[in-house]
């Protein structure tokens, strides 16, 4: 079952799947000036049996200059064509990740592929968030999102993360500031109670969080 939407957008954060569930599709997109080869695959598909998963189909790009058409490549399948980019980071697979049953690893790059990858995720997929460089992560909990099926509809859970500029000091309650030294926090340091005004802007994006962010500590 394909997830209807993209994972949640967290300002100043990118997300990444460490592994892709069987059924995931990756659009065969080419960079500017290139197009899919004639009769080439529209997408790669993560498929497998009980012991092994792999990507079916290969994406291939060729120079647009070889034909007099500059027709745009549309993401497929048809009903998914409005999907936004879901892979903003380098497609390199983290070296330490164990392979998971029923999951494919990051597909290797293909020649002249587009700079951003468009995935179509399936129910049960988990993605992980990181703040972009120059922004600090404030955690209420895990920086992850899972596509789940509820009452016949798919939805993504809300990552419990806010990315704030280095100079800003807003915090989630129950969260301590980053450690300045390996010696541990000073005994006098206490959790900062967040008020609504501190968080006016950030709360809008965190409004759908499944846990209240205005308690002084974990209940």
């Amino acid at each position: 079952e394909l997830c209807d939407d993209d994972p949640p957008e967290i300002p100043h954060a990118t997300f990444k799947a460490m592994a892709y569930k069987e059924g995931t599709m990756l659009n065969c997109e080419c960079k500017r000036g290139f197009r899919r080869i004639k009769s080439g695959s529209l997408y790669m598909l993560c498929t497998g049996n009980s012991s092994h998963s792999s990507w079916d189909n290969q994406c291939q790009c060729t120079s647009s200059a070889t034909r007099n058409t500059t027709k745009q490549v549309t993401p497929q399948p048809e009903e998914q064509k409005e999907r936004k980019t879901t892979e903003m980071q380098s497609p390199m697979q983290p070296v330490d990740q164990a392979s998971l049953p029923g999951h494919c690893r990051e597909p290797p790059p293909w020649e002249n592929e587009a700079t951003e990858r468009i995935y179509h995720f399936v129910v049960g997929q988990m993605v992980y968030y990181q703040c972009v460089q120059g922004y600090r992560a404030l955690h209420r909990g895990p920086a992850e999102s899972v596509c789940k099926m509820t009452h016949g509809k798919t939805r993504w859970t809300q990552p419990q993360l806010i990315c704030t500029g280095e100079m800003e000091t807003s915090q989630f309650p129950g969260e301590e500031k980053p450690q300045a030294s390996p010696e541990g926090r000073p005994e006098s340091e206490t959790s900062c109670l967040v008020t609504t005004t501190d968080f006016q802007i950030q709360t809008e994006m965190a409004a759908t969080m499944e846990t209240s962010i205005f308690t002084t500590e974990y209940q």
Partner: antibody, heavy 119, light 106 residues
């Protein structure tokens, strides 16, 4: 290869403090959070706290007043410090890492270090 | 905090049987993780996000559930499955573990 290893004092006197070091290899602490979990003998698992990749921390509120987690990224070490130990703090203490970045599913665990609180 | 209640506390089964253990949450959670633990060893990752198997977990294991009720099922139980299984949530703070289900093989 991802590895985590706890090292602790073994025996701690009541009312004293506990310091445990978790030394990791195969990944960077700047990319992954480390969580601490303990298990009293013959009992279940209890989550203590986490230090995220960026250095911020969350604690179990029941232990927050006497618990501190810090790290040294360059040495690939995470430190757990707990004050005012009592006999019911006797447990196996584990450090663990999530599968993805600052995630929740603990895919990698240390072998644990047994801490006995006794006079 | 969300309390996870695992039942039964002890589950006895014969090889080849299908067994199911449940994990009930005191409030609704988004997804559940499961761990297997052998005596004297660290917990092992077993199932994540309700239904995804960890590396090395036999295909006879499966996970399902939603809301406040989740389960781990072993299709044809084997002697090597005799261990304690813990569920864990982090939909709400703090993350909590269930009390465990000890699986015994007759």
């Amino acid at each position: 290869q991802v590895q985590l290893k706890e090292s602790g004092p073994g025996l701690v006197a009541p009312s004293q403090s506990l310091s445990i070091t978790c030394t990791v290899s195969g990944f960077s602490l700047t990319s992954y959070g480390i969580q601490w979990v303990r298990q009293p003998p013959g009992k279940g698992l209890e989550w203590l706290g986490v230090i995220w990749a960026g250095g911020s921390t969350n604690y179990n509120s029941a232990l927050m007043s006497r618990l501190s987690i810090s790290k040294d990224n360059s040495k690939s070490q995470v430190f757990l410090k707990m004050n005012s130990l009592q006999t019911d703090d006797t447990a196996m203490y584990y450090c663990a890492r999530a599968y993805g970045y600052d995630g929740s599913w603990l895919a990698y665990w240390g072998q644990g270090t047994l801490v006995t609180v006794s006079s | 905090q969300i309390v996870l209640s695992q039942s039964p506390a002890i589950l006895s089964a014969s090889p080849g049987e299908k067994v199911t253990m449940t994990c009930r949450a005191s409030s609704s959670v988004s997804y559940m993780h499961w761990y297997q633990q052998k005596p004297g060893s660290s917990p092992k990752p077993w199932i994540f996000a309700t239904s995804n198997l960890a590396s090395g977990v036999p295909a006879r294991f499966s996970g399902s559930g939603s809301g406040t009720s989740y389960s781990l099922t072993i299709n044809r139980v084997e002697a090597e499955d005799a261990d304690t299984y813990y569920c864990q949530q982090w939909s709400s703070n703090p993350p909590t573990f269930g009390g465990g289900t000890k699986l015994e093989i007759k």
